[in-house]
């Protein structure tokens, strides 16, 4: 066959559908690859062709649109299953062509089984609700286009395995499920089962999503630096290891990027002539507030390093904060010698700080390792 623009296998769209339920799958060409829609293509005389490769097979074959009760059909740019079967799993290709033009894309379709409690290998979307925030709703997802607006389906909501009836703060309202006030105890998987009639048959659509109760924007604050702080002094002798943790608490904020970084003498550690290692760890609370810790480490600290300014910075959508660590050179304890007893004074006192290379004062032309 002549050349065809092949967009390959679009693994970004791992389409999963439940066995024995209707599924409508739009050809991804018009949504993600081409600059025109199906109507334009159709009126320009282009034809949309569907074929598939079964799971664990290499052979492309046409889709059988002559199955009993039109189990598989095509309508405009949509491939319909009424309903799916387990062995419909495979890679599906839609191709748009005429005598002079051709473009195609493949995508994987997985038909999955669920148990009586709606457990399955299906990847679940996560919906975040703010804790103790007032009325919030979730909506039964991906049911548009399955039935006309004249059809009134019945919708049943479940939390885990249990039908939602007479729950204190959770009220089913058709396609919506309302949380009068959300608590941590509302975390879990919620399923809506939509039942609708079509041509004398009854179909069910099952949609499960995970509800995660997160910190409320009402309680959100700018980042809080717990360490370094004014109560801890990092007192070291040259040659010792300097370890300074920067521990920052971030309130949960939807779509906020939380950042923590160190500066040394106002510069990125990479631009300072010392061997610095920075290791980061992140932990989350039950409401997804985040604590980030970045430990700055200098294996063998020098007198010059003990004069530098070590500042931990943090930023979120709520603001930016910074805190300097108090780093000092340990003053050697006086040696109690005979001279001291005789009144000549200690021999080992003083700050013990040699004069550093003046070029290191504010200069940073050397390089070091930064992990």
């Amino acid at each position: 066959s002549e050349r065809c623009d092949d967009w390959g296998l679009d693994t970004m769209r791992q389409i999963q559908v439940f066995e024995d339920e209707p599924a409508r799958i739009k050809c991804p060409l018009f949504e993600h690859f081409l600059k025109f829609n199906y109507s334009t293509a159709h009126s320009a005389g282009l034809t949309l062709i569907w074929y598939w490769t079964r799971q664990d097979r290499d052979l492309e074959e046409p889709i059988n649109f002559r199955l009993p009760e039109n189990r598989i059909s095509k309508e405009k740019d949509v491939l319909w299953f009424r309903p799916t079967l387990l062995n419909d799993t495979g890679n599906y290709t839609c191709m748009l062509r005429n005598t002079t033009y051709c473009s195609k894309v493949a995508f994987p379709l997985e038909v999955v089984q669920k148990d009586s409690c709606f457990n399955s290998p299906m990847k679940l979307p996560v919906h975040k609700l703010y804790i103790e925030y007032g009325i919030q709703r979730i909506t039964c997802p991906n049911v548009d286009g399955y039935f006309p607006s004249s059809v009134k389906p019945t919708i049943t909501w479940y939390m885990g395995c249990y039908k939602i009836q007479n729950f204190n703060n959770v009220i089913p309202e058709g396609m919506n499920l309302s949380f009068l006030i959300a608590f941590i105890s509302n975390n879990g998987n919620y399923t809506c089962v939509v039942t609708y009639p079509e041509n004398g048959r009854t179909f069910h659509l099952t949609r499960t999503l995970t509800v995660k109760v997160v910190g409320s924007p009402k309680n959100a604050v700018p980042p809080v630096i717990h360490s370094p702080n004014d109560h801890v002094v990092y007192e070291k002798e040259p040659g010792e290891e300097l370890l300074i943790p920067c521990t920052v608490y971030f309130s949960f904020l939807m779509d906020s990027r939380n950042e923590v970084w160190w500066t040394i003498d106002g510069k990125k550690p990479d631009d300072i002539p010392i061997d610095v290692t920075i290791n980061e760890s992140i932990s989350h609370s039950r409401t997804e507030d985040e604590t980030r810790t970045q430990i700055l480490s200098i294996k063998k600290v020098t007198s010059e390093d003990l004069k530098r300014s070590y500042v931990c910075h943090a930023r979120s959508a709520k603001g930016e904060v910074a805190k300097a660590a108090t780093v000092k050179q340990k003053v050697p304890a006086p040696r109690y010698t005979v001279e001291l007893a005789c009144g000549f004074g200690a021999t080992g006192g003083g700050s013990g700080k040699p004069i550093p290379n003046p070029l290191l004062g504010l200069d940073s032309t050397h390089h070091h390792h930064h992990h």
């Epitope: 510069k267 500042v311 910074a322 700050s351 004062g361 940073s364």
Partner: antibody
Framework: EVQLQQSGAELVKPGASVRLSCTSS????????MHWVKQRTEQGLEWVGR????????QYAPNFQDKATITVDTSSNTVYLQLSSLTSEDTAVYYC??????????????WGQGTLVTVSP | DIQMTQTTSSLSASLGDRVTISCRAS??????LNWYQQKPDGTVKLLIY???TLHSGVPSRFSGSGSGTDYSLTISNLEPEDIATYYC?????????FGSGTKLEIK
């Protein structure tokens, strides 16, 4: 509240020396490098040098190596700038300042009100 | 030494205007640049450090940007109290150096 109080204006003769003072309050002077800059009339700022009050270690801009001496008296929270062999080129306002963060931070957040030095016969 | 050039020595603008003050370094200074404001009475304040970080207490109408050798300070909505001279300052290499200043006046 962080404050830097500088000494009053000085009128000095060419060839003489002058010592300017900068007394800090609201923070421990030992925790911050203290800096001086020079500003000639209608001109930009020129960094003179700095001192680590913890141990008295100093650093100067090359142009001021033989002109300026910075000292500190931690008991009175005061930093001094001594200028020697004065010429008309040294006529300027001199500012002391403190960084934003502990130690040798290069973000100069707190400034004194400036001291005018006039060198005139 | 790194030379900091503020080509516009004075600038006249109307209240409410958006004003941009520029500063050029004689070599790449890796964003290690601060901006200061000096009021007519000589008072000096840090406005922005590390190119774009607003110092606490500085109004959000001030912003900084730039990279490499070219940097700018923008005042989005000029207020009467913004009448001052603005200095850039690099701390990439020793010794730290300042621009010659841009004096901002009201039309």
């Amino acid at each position: 509240e962080v404050q830097l109080q500088q000494s009053g204006a000085e009128l000095v003769k060419p060839g003489a020396s002058v010592r300017l003072s900068c007394t800090s309050s609201g923070f421990n002077i030992k925790d911050y490098f203290m800096h001086w800059v020079k500003q000639r009339t209608e001109q930009g700022l020129e960094w003179v040098g700095r001192i680590d009050p913890e141990d008295g270690e100093t650093q100067y801009a090359p142009n001021f190596q033989d002109k300026a001496t910075i000292t500190v008296d931690t008991s009175s929270n005061t930093v001094y700038l001594q200028l020697s062999s004065l010429t008309s080129e040294d006529t300027a306002v001199y500012y002391c300042f403190r960084p934003l963060y502990y130690g040798n931070s290069p973000w100069f957040a707190y400034w004194g009100q400036g001291t005018l030095v006039t060198v005139s016969p | 030494d790194i030379q900091m050039t503020q080509t516009t020595s004075s600038l006249s603008a109307s209240l409410g205007d958006r004003v941009t003050i520029s500063c050029r370094a004689s070599q790449d200074i890796s964003n290690y640049l601060n901006w200061y404001q000096q009021k007519p009475d000589g008072t000096v304040k840090l406005l922005i450090y590390y190119t774009s970080t607003l110092h606490s207490g500085v109004p959000s109408r001030f912003s900084g940007s730039g990279s490499g050798t070219d940097y700018s300070l923008t005042i989005s909505n000029l207020e009467p109290e913004d009448i001052a001279t603005y200095y850039c300052h690099q701390y990439s290499k020793f010794p730290p150096t300042f621009g010659s200043g841009t004096k901002l006046e009201i039309k």
